[in-house]
């Protein structure tokens, strides 16, 4: 069952799924000047059996200018460098993590992918929130949201994270809360169902969150 709405927004925060439940769809979006190949699937789907989950279909983009060809256009060196680096970081971070049954990992980037990823989540999906760079957690309760089915309708639970740019000192002296902030998105782009594929955010959030999440929740 697909979740009707986007996960809740938190001002000055962004969210990330550590793993995607089977049934999750990821739109095959291409960046400006490129389009999905004619025979290509409009989305990738997280599917699996009892022992293994993976993304079905592969997203492929081709130049809008190129007619009747599926030739892949090589990304610019700068872009290629960033993608390779971030992909490597993701792989390194995830290598020693236990695979979560019934879930897929973040799909690797595809060439000429759009700068944002649009996911369609399913009931039972959890996403995790983090304050963006330049903001700190004034309050960090459960910084996660779960898509639940209640009375036949889906709803996301409300994360109890408040991010602030104010530098009010703690009223409990000596109690300093570590806050690893990922690179910031512009305010209009934070905390949306659309997640950025400029993987700086995702990988940094992953680096600070995944070990904690997996050790506390799944072991």
């Amino acid at each position: 069952e697909l979740c009707d709405d986007d996960p809740p927004k938190i001002t000055h925060a962004t969210f990330k799924a550590v793993a995607y439940k089977e049934g999750t769809m990821l739109n095959c979006e291409c960046k400006r000047g490129f389009r999905r190949i004619k025979s290509g699937s409009p989305y990738m789907l997280c599917t699996g059996n009892s022992s293994h989950s993976s993304w079905d279909n592969q997203c492929q983009c081709t130049s809008s200018a190129a007619r009747n060809t599926t030739k892949q256009v090589t990304p610019q060196p700068e872009e290629q460098k960033e993608r390779k680096t971030t992909e490597m970081q993701s792989q390194m971070q995830l290598a020693d993590q236990v695979s979560l049954p019934g879930h897929c990992r973040e799909p690797p980037p595809w060439e000429n992918e759009a700068t944002e990823r649009i996911y369609h989540f399913v009931v039972g999906q959890t996403v995790y929130y983090q304050c963006v760079q330049g903001y700190r957690a004034l309050h960090r309760g459960p910084a996660e949201s779960v898509c639940k089915m209640t009375h036949g309708k889906t709803r996301w639970t409300q994360p109890q994270l408040i991010c602030t740019g104010e530098t009010e000192p703690s009223q409990f002296p000596g109690e300093e809360e570590p806050q690893a902030s990922p690179d910031g998105l512009p305010e209009s782009e934070t905390s949306r169902l659309v997640t950025t594929t400029d993987f700086r955010i995702q990988t940094e959030v992953a680096a600070t969150m995944e070990t904690f999440i997996f050790t506390t929740e799944y072991q």
Epitope: T11, G141, Q158, P159, Q160, I162
Partner: antibody
């Protein structure tokens, strides 16, 4: 079930200070920030500030900066609001409210400031 | 600070009527908006959060909509127990501010 229980009504003289409490039960107290809101007689709702029940960090509406102090005691799951240099305009019902979306409210504490 | 303006400030309606209350923010607040109902002498009660999500236990005749600067609370079929004052409030960023309230009376 979730409950926020506030301390009883107070009558104060102008210039005095006031400290009211809000005790949370039925949930993990430190999971939810606590807001304070007041309502003058016949008026609307006015946000005073928010405190992290986890870290003790607080943010105040500019109007209350320097005059209001919010604190928490996690051992008793209680949030406090202290207001100094009281004036007649502070006569109001003071509420505590839980979390990002103010999903539960205390019953209110009536404060009367009069000479 | 973000100003929240509600309209109308008061209205009178009959049982079974469809009632709409609007709330306008002075700047874009996305969907960071809540609606509360308050009865005389009682604390406010959360009805809708994040502009359109119905709070637990709230009857389905209540619904919220809108995004950006314009928001609506709708009661599809007014019941006698729906009288009271309704407030909108944003949680976009501190300071959180409330609308001035809409007093709903049953005819």
């Amino acid at each position: 079930q979730v409950q926020l229980v506030q301390s009883g009504a107070e009558v104060k003289k102008p210039g005095a200070s006031l400290k009211i409490s809000c005790k949370g039960s039925g949930y993990t107290f430190t999971d939810y920030a606590m807001h304070w809101v007041r309502q003058a007689p016949g008026q609307g709702l006015e946000w005073i500030g928010v405190i992290s029940t986890y870290s003790g960090d607080a943010i105040y509406a500019q109007k209350f900066q320097g005059r209001a102090t919010m604190t928490v005691d996690t051992s008793t799951s209680t949030a406090y609001l202290e207001l100094s240099s009281l004036r007649s305009e502070d006569t109001a019902v003071y509420y505590c409210a839980r979390g990002v979306t103010f999903d539960y409210w205390g019953q209110g504490t009536t404060v009367t400031v009069s000479s | 600070d973000i100003q929240m303006t509600q309209s109308p400030s008061s209205l009178s309606a009959s049982v079974g009527d469809r009632v709409t209350i609007t709330c306008r923010a002075s700047q874009d607040i996305s969907n960071y908006l809540e609606w509360y109902q308050q009865k005389p002498g009682k604390a406010p009660k959360l009805l809708v959060y994040n502009a359109k999500t119905l709070a637990e236990g709230v009857p389905s005749r209540f619904s919220g909509s809108g995004s950006g600067t314009d928001f609506t609370l709708t009661i599809s079929s007014l019941q006698p127990e729906d009288f009271g004052t309704y407030y909108c409030q944003h949680h976009y960023d501190t300071p959180y501010t409330f609308g001035q309230g809409t007093k709903l009376e049953i005819k």
